[in-house]
Interface confidence: low
């Protein structure tokens, strides 16, 4: 009779993480009598995966009933596969011996490769807000995928970005891999509603990439522009001065009125109007009693936005002037049509 051969017909098996791997092994003869064992790896450091004779292997089941005397199929299934299970598995025939069974013949081995999906990409932006025209960095991370080949793309509002650097770790062989990418994004004043998207494509995702997003509203700070104007007199001795605070983001803003350098009133932006681009406008007004002033009055609108150093705009109120509308000679920009409706 021909000498027993241990046949592992599959050189490699590819299994998705979480699924069951079937490792096939057959023997050509029942002789010599003895058990089959499965190992991962070869040599003295090999790991026992299944022993037909004894032991408890909760994740392993046999394809056929190995208790039958005539059975020559020693295939096994390993359940709930993880990337850590990757490696080469050997089906090894032992011959009964005393005191221990003796290794008789090994199969050629089956390499188990595990396909594991990448984790959902996590996009994080800078710790502090930045203003338009500044370049900020976003990072994207995804972990636990296998095989190593992976594609990462960055988008801003659907437009692909090109200024980024990506690393996949580790460089050498591993059971699973991680990807880390840093993209540089130049902020514009219109970016309050913008999104940065990191898109990861991998063989396990079957053409449906994973996406992580970051809203630039968490990153951008659009500083306000100020305009102080004098409105028509409401009463013989009263002048209404308004401070238009335009195009700012986020909403956190505190305004202080100064009369000749002295604090007159402080208020926090509350009933703001939102522009289409996501920035805010706000208006504060100050009623000045002209009769209380002998000399000309310097009115200053001072704004502290989002914890930044205060910016201010001043208006000289001439006490001797006849009541009429006066424009500030330091006006920053024209009033938008949507502001005219306020009055």
């Amino acid at each position: 009779e021909e000498e027993l051969q241990v046949i592992q017909p599959d050189k490699s098996v590819l299994v998705a993480a979480g699924e069951t791997a079937t490792l096939r092994c057959t023997a050509t003869s029942l002789i010599p009598v003895g058990p089959i064992q499965w190992f991962r790896g070869a040599g003295p450091g090999r790991e026992l995966i299944y022993n037909q004779k004894e032991g408890h292997f909760p994740r392993v089941t046999t394809v056929s009933d190995l208790t039958k005397r005539n059975n020559m199929d020693f295939s096994i299934r390993i359940g709930n596969i993880t990337p850590a299970d990757a490696g080469t598995y050997y089906c090894v025939k032992f011959r009964k011996g005393s005191p221990d069974d003796v290794e008789f013949k090994s199969g050629a081995g089956t390499e188990l490769s595990v396909r594991a999906k990448p984790s959902a990409p996590v996009v994080s932006g800078p710790a502090a807000r930045a203003t338009p025209q500044h370049t900020v960095s976003f990072t994207c991370e995804s972990h636990g995928f296998s095989p190593r080949d992976i594609t990462l793309k960055w988008f801003k509002n659907g437009n692909e970005l090109s200024d980024f650097q990506t690393n996949v770790d580790p460089v050498g062989e591993s059971v699973s891999y991680s990807i880390h990418s840093t993209a540089k994004v130049v902020l514009t004043r219109e970016d309050v509603h913008s999104q940065v998207i990191c898109e990861v494509a991998h063989v396990t995702l079957q053409g449906d990439p994973l996406r992580g997003t970051a809203n630039l509203s968490e990153t951008i700070r659009v500083p306000p522009t100020l305009e102080v104007t004098q409105q028509p007199v409401r009463a013989e001795n009263q002048v209404n001065v308004t401070c238009q605070v335009r195009k700012f983001y986020p909403q956190r803003l505190q305004l202080t009125w100064l009369e000749n350098g002295n604090v007159s009133r402080t208020e926090t932006a509350s009933t703001v109007t939102e522009n289409k681009d996501g920035t805010y406008n706000w208006m504060s007004w100050l009623l000045v009693n002209v009769s209380a002033h002998r000399d000309d009055v310097k009115l200053t609108c001072q704004v502290e936005h989002d914890g930044q150093p205060a910016v201010s705009k001043s208006h000289d109120l001439k006490v001797s002037a006849h009541p009429k509308e006066q424009g500030s000679n330091t006006a920053a920009e024209n009033t938008g049509s949507n502001e005219r409706n306020i009055y």
């Epitope: 079937t22 059975n71 020559m72 199929d73």
Partner: antibody, heavy 121, light 108 residues
Framework: VQLVESGGGVVRPGESLRLSCAAS????????MSWVRQAPGEGLEWVSL????????YYADSVKGRFTISRDNSKNTLYLQMNSLRAEDTAIYYC???????????????WGLGTPVTVSS | EIVLTQSPGTLSVSPGERATLSCRAS??????LAWYQQKLGQAPRLLIY???TRATDIPDRFSGSGSGTEFTLTISSLQSEDFAVYYC??????????FGGGTKVEIK
Amino acid sequence: VQLVESGGGVVRPGESLRLSCAASGFTFSNYAMSWVRQAPGEGLEWVSLITTNGDGAYYADSVKGRFTISRDNSKNTLYLQMNSLRAEDTAIYYCAKDGAAHYYDIFFDYWGLGTPVTVSS
Amino acid sequence: EIVLTQSPGTLSVSPGERATLSCRASQNVRSDLAWYQQKLGQAPRLLIYDANTRATDIPDRFSGSGSGTEFTLTISSLQSEDFAVYYCQHYYDWPPVTFGGGTKVEIK
């Protein structure tokens, strides 16, 4: 469990037919499905098998390249597109559900009543 | 391709008697074998799988045995409704899935 075939009929050699099998009473998407045929007065001949999600299709040599098996799990329906039909394809075509516990074992625990296909000039 | 040979082609048995049907595989198919019953004008019905396991709702007068290349279907006491054609089928190696040629059990 119920399997109901339809779409059989009389065609000329070289023509096409599309068979359907409507499944009910079990979770269709969990099982491989097959077509098995039986020529008049003959035994059973396996024709084709499709895996649970439809990504694997297997055929007997006698129909390879001419027949296409497919499934729509959302409609619980199995199909067999038969092109370039020959006289030797004349048979009752049965739709059969896989009853095996393991994905590589194939036997059939439920069968439809069959639909007749006659190929004759 | 594994060939299944069923014998005899026809078996004449009296009601109440024992019927023994044979199925031989051209190579070892382990216990990967099923048996079906087909009555005239009807679809096949699964009787036995894994060589010796009865399918759901199959009476215990039907039993399967054997492994490797030699398999037997035994009907311990034939009832009138048991007269039919019986097919074996292996699933050791596929495609193709192959059936035996059938054994017709008729009333003696």
